[in-house]
Structures are given as structure tokens and as C-alpha cells.
Interface confidence: medium
């Protein structure tokens, strides 16, 4: 009958701005993997059937409703059963192949925030308006892709660190829109970096910093 397939372990959700994969170990030898995903009240859906990879893209499933809690499991399927689709995933006596459950995953609560991008900054006198790009996600509504702000609404804020090019002491500001209006000293050039933050989260609360943008490198009215 051959060696029974090994069970997957270290099942991990890897998710940034809702782009989501499930990863696991080990690399299979005489068997393949099939992933199943469902909501708590839904039916199992087959993904990555018969794969020898150790990851499976599940973005298209979780973006259907990012506030749902998703269950997933990785089935280890012997070669003889893995080549003809799900009808033959089960053994000749109908037994279920070995599987490992992934931790529950609620995208809205857990997806990592990707580093934001400073879209533009514009100085008028002693004020600078810094605009953060409203990043598009893969979450759809009415056939259009929603931005991070569309999805998270008032749960999302941005924080800005800014400092004079000639010094290292940074000041900070926060906004629950995508724009900052800050006071600066006339004749000084400033550098800026922003972070996306969901203050009421306990995990994956903040993104990494955006790339630093500085005034005076091109001109004060600066657009990407």
C-alpha cells in the first residue's frame, strides 16, 4: 500500500493588504497537497488541488468578505489519488486523507498593512500638505477594487514623521484622512515618512515606514 503521506505542519497565513497565501511545511515526497477553505458556516472549497508547492494563494476567496473568519486545512494525498481531481482524493474505502488545520484567520483583524507611499507634498508659505496614496486592495465591491481607506474606514489612520533635512529630531502628526497639513519653518527643507496604523488592533497594528521623501530634491510641489 506504500508509505502513508506525511501531514503538513507549521501552517501559516501570510497576508498583506488582503493579498493572502497559506504556507506550510514540508516539501512533499511521494504525495501531493490539496487545500480546503471555508467560512465557519460554509462548505469546504478545494484550492490548489494536487500541488507539490508548500503554499496556496487564497486571496480570491478571502476578499469575498474580509470580515468573515476563514478556516483552512491542508490535505496530504497519495500520488495514486491526486491526479484526477477531488473525486479521487479519498482512498478506495472512502477514508479521508490526513490533514492539518490552519489557525482561524479573519482578514480584517489580521492582514498586515503594507508600507504606504507618499503621493505628493506641497508647500504654501509655512504649511506643507502631505498626501498619502490611497492604496488599492484586491477587495471588490460592485466590480471595482476598494482602497485601503474604503475597506477600513475610520479604523485606519496614518502617522507622519517629519524632520528638517539638516537635523535628526523628528516631529509626528496623525490623520484619519489621507492628508496632513503641518507647520514648517520657512526656508527649511523637510523629510517625510508615513505609516499606516489601525490603533484599535492588538496584532499587526502598524505598517512598516514608507520610503522617505525629502523637499528640495526636485522641487517643493512634488508628485510621483
Amino acid at each position: 500500500a506504500g508509505t502513508p503521506p506525511g501531514k503538513a505542519f507549521n501552517l501559516t497565513w501570510i497576508s498583506a493588504d488582503f493579498k493572502t497565501i497559506l504556507a506550510w511545511q514540508p516539501k512533499p515526497t511521494n504525495y501531493t497537497y490539496t487545500v480546503q477553505i471555508s467560512t465557519k458556516s460554509g462548505d469546504w472549497k478545494y484550492k490548489c488541488t494536487g500541488t507539490t508547492d508548500t503554499e496556496c494563494a487564497l486571496t480570491d476567496e478571502i476578499v469575498k468578505d474580509v470580515k468573515q473568519t476563514y478556516l483552512a486545512r491542508v490535505l496530504s494525498v497519495p500520488w495514486r489519488n491526486s491526479t484526477h481531481g477531488k473525486e479521487t482524493l479519498f482512498g478506495t474505502h472512502g477514508e479521508e486523507p490526513p490533514f492539518t488545520n490552519a489557525p482561524e484567520f479573519t482578514p480584517y483583524l489580521e492582514t498586515n498593512l503594507g508600507a504606504p507611499t507618499i503621493q505628493s507634498f506641497e508647500q504654501v508659505g509655512t504649511k506643507v500638505n502631505v498626501t498619502v496614496e490611497d492604496e488599492r486592495t484586491l477587495v471588490r465591491r460592485n466590480n471595482t477594487f476598494l482602497s485601503l481607506r474604503d475597506v477600513f474606514g475610520k479604523d485606519l489612520i496614518y502617522t507622519l514623521a517629519y524632520w528638517k533635512s539638516s537635523s535628526s529630531g523628528a516631529k509626528t502628526a496623525a490623520t484619519n484622512t489621507n492628508e496632513f497639513l503641518i507647520d514648517v519653518d520657512k526656508g527649511e527643507n523637510y523629510c517625510f515618512s508615513v505609516q499606516a496604523v489601525i490603533p484599535s488592533r492588538t496584532v499587526n497594528r502598524a505598517s512598516t515606514d514608507s520610503p522617505v521623501e525629502c523637499m528640495g530634491q526636485e522641487h517643493h510641489h512634488h508628485h510621483h
Epitope: 465557519k40 468573515q68 475610520k154 479604523d155 489612520i157 484599535s200
Partner: antibody, heavy 118, light 107 residues
Amino acid sequence: EVQLVQSGAEVKKPGASVKVSCKASGYSFTGYYMNWVRQAPGQGLEWMGEINPSTGGSTYNQKFKARVTMTVDQSTSTVYMELSSLRSEDTAVYYCARRELGGPFGYWGQGTTVTVSS
Amino acid sequence: SIVMTQSPDSLAVSLGERATINCKASQSVSNGIAWYQQKPGQSPKLLIYFASNRYTGVPDRFSGSGYGTDFTLTISSLQAEDVAVYYCQQDYSSPWTFGGGTKVEIK
């Protein structure tokens, strides 16, 4: 430990105003919206509005918009709800409640009883 | 605004038996539903959010289900301390609205 401590009971005459306070502790005050919910005697729960302690911006239930004002004092981690032009049907227990990520109210104050009577 | 209708208004269940409370939204709220428990003289307590997620510290005899317009709170084995009024609330669209409440008692 997260705590929301509200001010004491109030008795008011019709037409007067009442200002209820809610002092927060045990968490990052500016990170969570604060909501106000009221409950008339023997009745259900009714949402009045919410305030962002970080900016002071507020959103009100249309029903109360003309009469309610929510404010914040960051220095004392306190939010306030003032209701004006009181009438007998405003007799209720008024709760402050912290809005959790995604919308639900995870922590509630102990409630403040407001009685409107001539 | 979205109207939340709870049923039944009251429910008497024997200790150890299952209690089921229903909540219907006047339009789809996706899974934007929370359930609260309120004991006499106390503030409400959050039990369930996102329709089916148990809040921190909530016993696993409490479970929620549903999507769209129809939702259910189930207490799988009623305990004496579960006597309370239970409310559903939609947090999908402002103004946030609550159901009228269901009183759960011991039979």
C-alpha cells in the same frame, strides 16, 4: 485593565440640559472611538453617536443631532455627552461604550441615570 | 436606517437545554452583527462580533451564525448565570441599530 467610569445620576427639569462624563483608563485613549448608547426604563438600547478622541470629530444619530454634543478632553482621557432641551422621554440610563475594531462595543461604562421630571 | 427585529421576545428554557435567539435585519448587513448580554442592573456585555466570533472570555456554549439578513445566537447548554436579556446589533451601516431584545429565563 480597561475601565470606563461615568459621572453620577442626574435629575433635571424639562427644557434643561445635562452633561454626562465618561473617564477612560487602562488603554490608549485616542486609539478607540467612544460611543453613547441610552436605554429608557424597561426598553431596549438606542445608539446616540460617537466621537473620535484623537480628533474630536463626532457622528450623531440623526434623531439626536439637533440636541446632542459630544466633546473630549485628552488631558484627562474623558469624553462628555451633553443633551439639551430635555423632555420626559429622555429619562434613561446613558452608557458610554468603546468601539472595537470593525464596529462592536467591547467595553461599557456603568451607566448614568438621567431623570427628567417637573 | 436598518431595522433589527429579534424573536422571540422571551424564552424559557430548562437548565442544560439549548436556547436559540433569532435576529433579522431589514436589509443585508453582511456579517456585521454583534450580540450582547445584559443582566438586570448591569451594563451590556459583548458576546459575539462579526456574526460568529466569540469575544474574549466568552464561554464556548455561546455561538453565533448567519449572514446577510438572518442571524442566530445559540446557547448550547443553558446555565443559571445565562438568565439575561440578549440584544443583536448591526454595525454595518450608521446609525448603528439594536434589536428589541430577547429575555431568557429558566423553565
